[in-house]
Interface confidence: medium
């Protein structure tokens, strides 16, 4: 806490400008009007304040807005956002995607901090659902964002938002999350033709049930081994050797290299040796 002191004569700041970097902390506290700061927040990023000076500016805004900052100020926080605590952010009502983008830009290149996680949570809750534009924005800044959500949170994602999801956005998703996302993807892409549909649905297939895999095996999709290895074991086990052969197409030879790993290992153990021999890969059931 900076103690209250009178502003020295001639040092009252008429505007937020670069001369303020040479103000001591107590001078900033005494000589910068909080309301002026709030209206000229966009200038702060153009001034290389030290961390300690930023603390003073934050303190001034906190005094001016004890119930939480208005969005007009939040949008222009810039680097001052890095000084906010999750508790500060919980007081905010952020509704504009532009505000969200501006603050995510400040944190760009860093891990998702507790502040950013709180900001996103406040924003999504305010919108009521994770719409396509929001998802587009969030996955652009944090490719792993979708997989950081719980299955319950993912259930609020409308199928239309799935179009914003890129394969890399699902890299760290576990089966429980894919179980939620797959039916939404299936619905989102249902009007596409066979090959285009497979390209889009491929990264979601870790949540696909057996009957959908059987259906895909009839469409000459040539699934690669990396995708096959991510399928649910319980969905793969009922597939016949013929169905797996059709599903993988030319990639079927890759089963040999994966024979000791799930789900291939478990699937092999469920098959008749005669059927496995038809593949000519030397797989032992």
């Amino acid at each position: 806490e900076v103690e209250k002191t009178a502003c020295p004569s001639g040092k009252k700041a008429p505007e937020i400008d670069e001369s303020l970097i040479f103000y001591k902390k107590w001078e900033l506290e005494a000589c910068v009007d909080a309301a002026l700061l709030a209206t000229q927040m966009d200038r702060v990023n153009a001034i290389p304040f030290t961390y300690e000076q930023l603390d003073v500016l934050k303190h001034k805004l906190d005094e001016l807005y004890p119930q939480g900052y208005p969005e007009s100020v939040i949008q222009h926080l810039g680097y001052l956002f890095l000084k906010m605590s999750p508790e500060d952010i919980r007081k905010w009502n952020v509704t504009s995607l532009e505000t969200l983008k501006a603050l995510l830009e400040v944190n760009k290149g860093h891990e998702m901090s507790p502040q950013v996680a709180t900001l996103i949570d406040r924003f999504v809750k305010g919108r009521g659902q994770l719409d396509k534009d929001t998802l587009d924005t969030l996955t652009a800044f944090y490719p792993g964002y979708l997989c950081s959500l719980s299955p319950e949170e993912l259930s609020s994602v409308p199928p239309s938002s799935i179009w914003a999801v890129r394969p890399q956005d699902l890299d760290t998703c576990d089966p429980r999350q894919l179980d939620v996302l797959y039916p939404k993807a299936r619905l989102a892409f249902q009007n596409m033709n066979g090959s285009e549909y497979f390209v889009k649905i491929q990264s979601f297939l870790g949540g696909a049930p057996t009957e959908d895999l059987k259906a895909l095996s009839q469409q000459n999709v040539s699934m690669d081994l990396a995708t096959f290895m991510k399928l649910r074991t319980d969905a793969v086990l009922p597939l016949t050797v013929a169905e797996v052969q059709k599903l993988l197409g030319p990639h079927v030879e890759g089963l040999k290299a994966e024979e000791r790993h799930r789900p291939v290992r478990d699937w092999i153990l469920r098959q008749r040796q005669d059927d496995l021999d038809t593949l000519g890969l030397g797989l032992q059931g």
């Epitope: 670069e18 990023n45 001034i47 290389p48 304040f49 030290t50 961390y51 300690e52 680097y79 890095l82």
Partner: antibody, heavy 121, light 107 residues
Framework: QVQLQQPGAELIKPGASVKLSCKAS????????MHWVKQRPGQGLEWIGI????????NYNERFKSKATLTVDKSSSTAYMQLSSLTSEDSAVYYC??????????????WGTGTTVTVSS | DIVMTQSHRFMSTSVGDRVSITCKAS??????VAWYQQKPGQSPKLLIY???TQHTGVPDRFTGSGSGTDFTLTINNVQSEDLLDYFC?????????FGAGTKLELK
Amino acid sequence: QVQLQQPGAELIKPGASVKLSCKASGYTFTSYWMHWVKQRPGQGLEWIGIIHPNIGSTNYNERFKSKATLTVDKSSSTAYMQLSSLTSEDSAVYYCARRSSNYGDWYFDVWGTGTTVTVSS
Amino acid sequence: DIVMTQSHRFMSTSVGDRVSITCKASQDVGTSVAWYQQKPGQSPKLLIYWASTQHTGVPDRFTGSGSGTDFTLTINNVQSEDLLDYFCQQYSSYPLTFGAGTKLELK
């Protein structure tokens, strides 16, 4: 990797001016503040000033306000410092330096190679 | 301006020893202090920031401590390649200022 390349040396006559360059590579030049630091032989370091390549905002140490002018050329990712009315006191190594991450952390983990300026007739 | 005083311009040590280089700020700078190492004819290299946080790739034998006005860079098990110049810097307020440096020498 991140690099700040500076010419090795400049020999300048007293009273003249010199424009030192600092070519950045390996990062987005316009996203980070660039600082300039002076080091006289066998002495400590002095902070000269700072410039933001994107917004052109500059701030100077009071001691260098009438001596140094900082500019940038975004198209070539190069920062410049012009030193005017040179005297023997300006003979020194001049470094450009960059903080690689957070705003507010004004210490430097990326330094230029340094330019030795010698003022002599 | 905040003056950073490194009281020893030179310090003698032996390989394998532990040495502490001190830096005193003329006013409270919190933990906004960095330490640099400099080889002759080269640019400084960051060792420590925020008074005690080790920069990436810096050997564990280099540690920083202190807050307020008194700061220390400690080198445990000094190696021959550590016999160089060391500078402190404050970034609590402008203008940013450096210590005059301490040169580590062999006893």
